[in-house]
Interface confidence: medium
């Protein structure tokens, strides 16, 4: 709205940098062939690039990425009894970010 | 995968708490009737509840919310010239979070 402006602070741009985000661990990451199980924990923290850039045609992109394997529980329910197994999920953390030029989409030929 | 487990740390649940997120200021928040303008900054930081809960049937929800008005620039392009105006956008910050019971979905009658 273009209403009362007196108490409003100037909005500060959310700069392009890494922030802590919540990543949901989908079952497909662990087993694409079977859906009869649960994953624990269901979500973890990851570092991801986010924010805006000062110019158009640029986007906040990671310039350095690190893969981080973590152990989760794969809980299969078999005949009303849980079977716990360890599974490894590889998370992607962004270590550094940059406002990078977005390559123009190539025309379809 | 259930592959090599040696270097993987146990995954820690992303607990239910406030985290800094990037909120995109859409033009609709400022003027629903006109699309012929830009907003600056295009995005800002807000505090939002995120994460997972230890139990079933509960969700991470805000228990305390604060509205925060901020000033943005509304940049209208009139005859190829920019006209700057001030606009106020009200952001919503989450101050506290809790894992709250999700009410069972009512059956459609």
């Amino acid at each position: 709205s273009l209403g009362s402006l007196t108490i409003a602070e100037p909005a500060m741009i959310a700069e392009c940098k890494t922030r802590t985000e919540v990543f949901e661990i989908s079952r497909r990451l662990i087993d694409r062939t079977n859906a009869n199980f649960l994953v624990w924990p269901p979500c973890v923290e990851v570092q991801r690039c986010s924010g805006c850039c000062n110019n158009r045609n640029v986007q906040c992109r990671p310039t350095q990425v690190q893969l981080r394997p973590v152990q989760v529980r794969k809980i299969e329910i078999v005949r009303k009894k849980p079977i716990f197994k360890k599974a490894t999920v590889t998370l992607e953390d962004h270590l550094a970010c940059k406002c990078e030029t977005v390559a123009a989409a190539r025309p379809v030929t | 995968s259930l592959g090599s487990l040696t270097i993987a740390e146990p995954a820690m649940i992303a607990e239910c708490k406030t985290r800094t997120e990037v909120f995109e200021i859409s033009r609709r928040l400022i003027d629903r009737t006109n699309a012929n303008f830009l907003v600056w900054p295009p995005c800002v930081e807000v505090q939002r509840c995120s994460g997972c809960c230890n139990n079933r049937n509960v969700q991470c929800r805000p228990t305390q919310v604060q509205l925060r008005p901020v000033q943005v620039r509304k940049i209208e392009i009139v005859r190829k010239k920019p006209i700057f105006k001030k606009a106020t956008v009200t952001l919503e910050d989450h101050l506290a979070c809790k894992c709250e019971t999700v009410a069972a979905a009512r059956p459609v009658t």
Partner: antibody, heavy 120, light 106 residues
């Protein structure tokens, strides 16, 4: 204060029955799986039985299968262990313990235990 | 049925490092927890999910688990650490405890 308080132990003859109770307080009982663990005099810990948050999953150690029944009343914040056909080797301190998740996991809170003695 | 094997006793001098092992077939495929029990008291969780410490447990307690062996390590052992220690793992529909290790601080 978060705590578990067992009761119902005592002296019983072989072949007899006992019902143990575990009253939970200080946490949302209905959200967590629970277990019974026992310890014979001078011996180690032995897991006895488990029940999930809503009671839909239950399982037992082979040594008690068919004789013991675990149950819970979430409205009363209470866990139970019905013990039938008791044997001398069931003599032990019985602990109720809480898991941190609905499905199980480690045992992060233990009661003080109640002694069951099976003897003629 | 699955078995977890622990040494019956381990001795350590104050200030030294104590290591208690727990072995079982492919134990590294399961999450291992460790419990401390002092005479006349209920067990207390000291390590969960192989290597995590619950709040309130001193930093000198640590754990690892790979292959067929899990290890509880107590660095800078204190007299107050003298107790029985039990490993535990959830395997094949049942919680299994090791036989326990009596830690003596000389």
């Amino acid at each position: 204060e978060v705590q578990l308080l067992e009761s119902g132990g005592g002296l019983v003859q072989p072949g007899g029955s006992l019902r143990l109770s575990c009253a939970a307080s200080g946490f949302t009982f209905s959200s967590y799986a629970m277990s019974w663990v026992r310890q014979a005099p001078g011996k180690g810990l032995e897991w006895v039985s488990y029940i999930s948050d809503d009671g839909s999953l239950k399982y037992y150690a082979d040594s008690v299968k068919g004789r013991f029944t675990i149950s819970r009343d979430n409205s009363k914040n209470t866990l139970y262990l019905q013990m039938n056909s008791l044997r001398a080797e069931d003599t032990a301190v019985y602990y109720c313990a809480k898991h941190p998740y609905w499905y199980g996991g480690q045992l992060d809170l233990w009661g003080q235990g109640t002694l069951v003695t099976v003897s003629s | 049925s699955y078995e977890l094997t622990q040494p019956p006793s381990v001795s350590v001098s104050p200030g030294q490092t104590a290591s208690i092992t727990c072995s079982g077939d492919s134990l590294g495929s399961y999450f291992v927890h460790w419990y401390q029990q002092k005479p006349g008291q209920s067990p207390v969780l000291v390590i969960y999910d192989d290597s995590n410490r619950p709040s309130g447990i001193p930093e000198r307690f640590s754990g690892s688990n790979s292959g067929n062996t899990a290890t509880l390590t107590i660095s800078g052992t204190q007299a107050m650490d003298e107790a029985d220690y039990y490993c535990s793992a959830f395997t094949h529909n049942s919680d299994v405890f090791g036989g326990g290790t009596k830690l003596t601080v000389l």
